[in-house]
């Protein structure tokens, strides 16, 4: 058997091979050693033996997209069945007083391979053994601790494969410079030891996407608005927009990235090195957001142009210079980069919205009739923008960090928006007091400290100061 | 678009050499490789070889190894070949064409999406 | 080098009908195949990658199938603007190798 006869259902193009060459990695037409790494189709019963107590379960994950050009990481992580764990030996044990539906377990081991390695590890004098093999025949390398290694992988890609030796979790990073743009499938057999050969336990696919263009999320926030996530913005408040590039192999960490940004209102181009903006819009509408991020990424330098062909026999007089063989639009760049850009586009609505709250005054309510520990407190509160139809107090202590009381009421206010708040206190003290206006789109706050005195007893009366 | 501009025609001696220029437009030139294929009057279609555009690597039909040079100019978006040592067998229309690709399932296909308008070479004293 | 073989040379037949060309890999290529159409004095174009999936605008009439070593081209109810020439291409190895073309000519 072949390695994509093992791995694939579909057997790969050698002209798609030679067109995603992958650094380290080998042709899916090798040779597979079927003895010591027996293969099993789907819905095979020994599936079902392969593991003690269950089957063991891959999981597979990369930070796709990748940038072509960039490092992709693949992680797969064992999950092994209930109870049981990968010991620092590498060895398989039951976690102590778990309980399974086979109860707890006498054995504390469900795979010992320490003491299998130890007492039946036949080897020659270079120590390598003859099982001590990738599926191709390629041997193990002995990196310390190599014998507590007990699972091989066998990463497959693009009819090529990587294979590798781990505990119950791996990474393999590829460099996606030859890789097709596009997504592509990763697919991941897991072997277990088992005396001198290796079983089957696990198999896992999963898409990852190689793209051309730099991936671009961008994240929107403004003060008061209510919901950053529904794309509807606050007229006259500035909005916060902030690039982040999914580049998590750092393959663009010495580019110089230009964003360019167009809001959609006539306020022509803004251009930024840095990825975070302000801006603000002055009308009320619907606006299309477009931005354009450059990169000049590293990219690989083209050879150099072949000589000139040798004239068959001496010219008289020079050519144009057009026919020079590098002419001046071929010289690569010293460092030979290549631009790459990428694309962000929103459609944002920008409506009316209340831009700001103020208590003007605070005032200690006259009770005729005190209450044993209350005090009333009126604040008087203006704002600016449109008109709240909600009032939210929330009274919590000096650091404002523990809520002490939270009320929120309907509110009725004019054109002018004066409204008086007034709210009840527990007892003298300092109090931090979070006063929110909002209406349907926005959410204004203020904030103030204020200090309730302690309540004279003989007087039924008192005035704020 | 995506569009693939060459020259419409170059008449040579021969002996002499030709280069041959593409000119691509309407997508990210160094993301594909580019084909050249060559037809001679009244024939049918002959590959000569493929470029990466991005990296320069290059794969030669064995026959035309020794005849056509393929480069690229990645800051002008130009595929070029060289055709050298001409002969009355080299007139002929040399197209280039963009390798394009599909996602498969597991692997990506290949086909030639885009062709140029192909360059009349005519070999002649 | 695989050998890419079409038949029929040539054909000729009537507005409206429909016709088959097909074409033979002389060994497996496992469905890594398209098909081109070139009308005179013009370029070819694409008009079916991965043995049976039209590229994008192909008209529906045209249908790919096929596998393993033996492929076909179908046009149904042929149109005035079909003829010209056709031409299948493997993707297996390199290099990639034409057919020698199918000529469509009108009855």
């Known amino acids: 058997k072949r390695f994509h006869d093992v791995l694939g259902n579909e057997r790969p193009s050698a002209y798609m091979r030679e067109h995603n060459q992958l650094n380290g990695w080998s042709s899916d037409e090798n040779d597979w050693n079927e003895k010591l790494y027996p293969v099993w189709k789907r819905g095979d019963m020994r599936w079902k033996n392969s593991w003690k107590g269950g089957r063991v379960q891959a999981v597979l994950t990369s930070d796709s997209p990748a940038l072509v050009g960039s490092n992709i990481t693949f992680v797969v992580n064992l999950v092994f069945p209930r109870c049981q764990k990968e010991d620092a030996n590498g060895n398989i044990v039951y976690e102590k007083n778990c309980r399974n539906e086979a109860g707890l377990s006498a054995d504390p081991y469900v795979y010992n391979w320490t003491a299998w390695s130890e007492d039946s590890d036949g080897e020659n004098g270079t120590g390598q053994s003859h099982h001590n093999v990738f599926p191709d025949g390629k041997p193990f390398p002995h990196h310390p601790g190599w014998r507590r290694w007990n699972f091989v992988y066998v990463f497959h890609t693009l009819g090529q494969y990587f294979q590798k030796l781990g505990r119950c979790s791996v990474r393999v990073s590829v460099n996606t410079a030859n890789v097709t743009l596009g997504p592509q499938l990763m697919e991941v057999t897991v072997y277990r030891r088992h005396g001198r050969a290796y079983v089957p336990i696990a198999q896992v696919k999963d898409v990852y996407v190689v793209t051309d263009q730099i991936p671009v999320f961008v994240t929107m926030s403004q003060k008061n608005d209510r919901n950053s996530s529904d794309e509807t913005f606050l007229k006259d408040l500035p909005i916060t927009f902030d690039v982040l590039i999914h580049d998590p192999s750092h393959f663009l960490n010495y580019s110089t990235i230009n964003y360019k940004w167009s809001f959609g209102d006539n306020t022509g181009l803004f251009v930024s090195i840095n990825h975070t903006v302000n801006h603000t819009y002055v009308l009320n509408g619907t606006f299309s957001l477009n931005l354009t991020v450059k990169a000049a990424a590293p990219g690989p330098c083209p050879p150099p142009p072949p000589p000139p062909p040798r004239p068959p026999k001496p010219t008289p007089s020079l050519g144009p210079a057009g026919d020079n063989p590098l002419g001046l639009s071929e010289i690569p760049d010293e460092n030979c980069q290549i631009n790459r850009y990428g694309h962000f586009q929103a459609t944002i609505t920008i409506v009316e919205g209340i831009l700001e709250v103020n208590i003007i005054q605070t005032t200690d309510v006259l009770m005729l009739v005190p209450g044993p520990d209350s005090s009333l407190i009126d604040f008087v509160v203006t704002c600016q923008g449109s008109i709240p139809t909600e009032v939210c107090t929330i009274i919590s202590d000096p650091t404002c960090e523990i809520t002490q009381n939270a009320v929120c009421s309907p509110v009725d206010v004019d054109e002018m928006c004066l409204l008086t708040v007034r709210r009840a206190f527990n007892g003298s003290g300092t109090y931090c007091v979070n006063l929110t206006l909002g209406d349907d789109t926005s959410l204004a706050l203020t904030s103030t400290l204020i200090s309730v005195p302690d309540r004279d007893p003989a007087s039924s009366l008192r005035m704020a100061n | 678009q995506v569009q693939l501009q060459q020259p419409g025609a170059e008449l040579v001696k021969p002996g002499a050499s030709v280069k041959l220029s593409c000119k691509a437009s309407?997508?990210?030139?160094?993301?594909?490789?580019m084909h050249w294929v060559k037809q001679r009057p009244g024939q049918g279609l002959e590959w000569i070889g493929e470029?990466?555009?991005?990296?320069?690597?290059?794969n030669y039909n064995e026959k035309f190894k020794t005849k056509a040079t393929l480069t690229v100019d990645r800051s002008s978006s130009t595929a070029y070949m060289q055709l050298s040592s001409l002969t009355s067998e080299d007139s002929a229309v040399y197209y280039c064409?963009?390798?394009?690709?599909?996602?498969?399932?597991?692997?990506?296909?290949?086909?030639?999406?885009?062709w140029g308008q192909g360059t009349s070479v005519t070999v002649s004293s | 080098d695989i050998q890419m073989t079409q038949s029929p040379a040539s054909l000729s037949v009537s507005v409206g009908e429909t016709v088959t060309i097909t074409c033979r890999a002389s060994?497996?290529?496992?469905?890594?195949l398209a098909w081109y159409q070139q009308k005179q004095g013009k370029s070819p174009q694409l008009l079916v990658y991965?043995?049976?999936n039209l590229a994008d605008g192909v008209p529906s009439r045209f249908s790919g199938s096929g596998s393993g070593t033996q492929y076909s081209l179908k046009i149904n109810s042929l149109q005035s603007e079909d003829f010209g020439s056709y031409y299948c291409?493997?993707?297996?190895?390199?290099?990639?190798?034409f057919g020698g073309g199918t000529k469509l000519e009108i009855k």
């Open positions: 064409a963009r390798l394009g690709y599909y996602s498969g399932s597991p692997y990506p296909y290949y086909a030639m999406d885009c």
């Open positions: 309407g997508y990210t030139f160094t993301s594909y490789w």
């Open positions: 991965a043995a049976t």
């Open positions: 470029i990466n555009s991005s990296n320069g690597r290059t």
């Open positions: 060994e497996n290529i496992y469905s890594n």
């Open positions: 291409q493997h993707f297996w190895n390199t290099p990639p190798t």
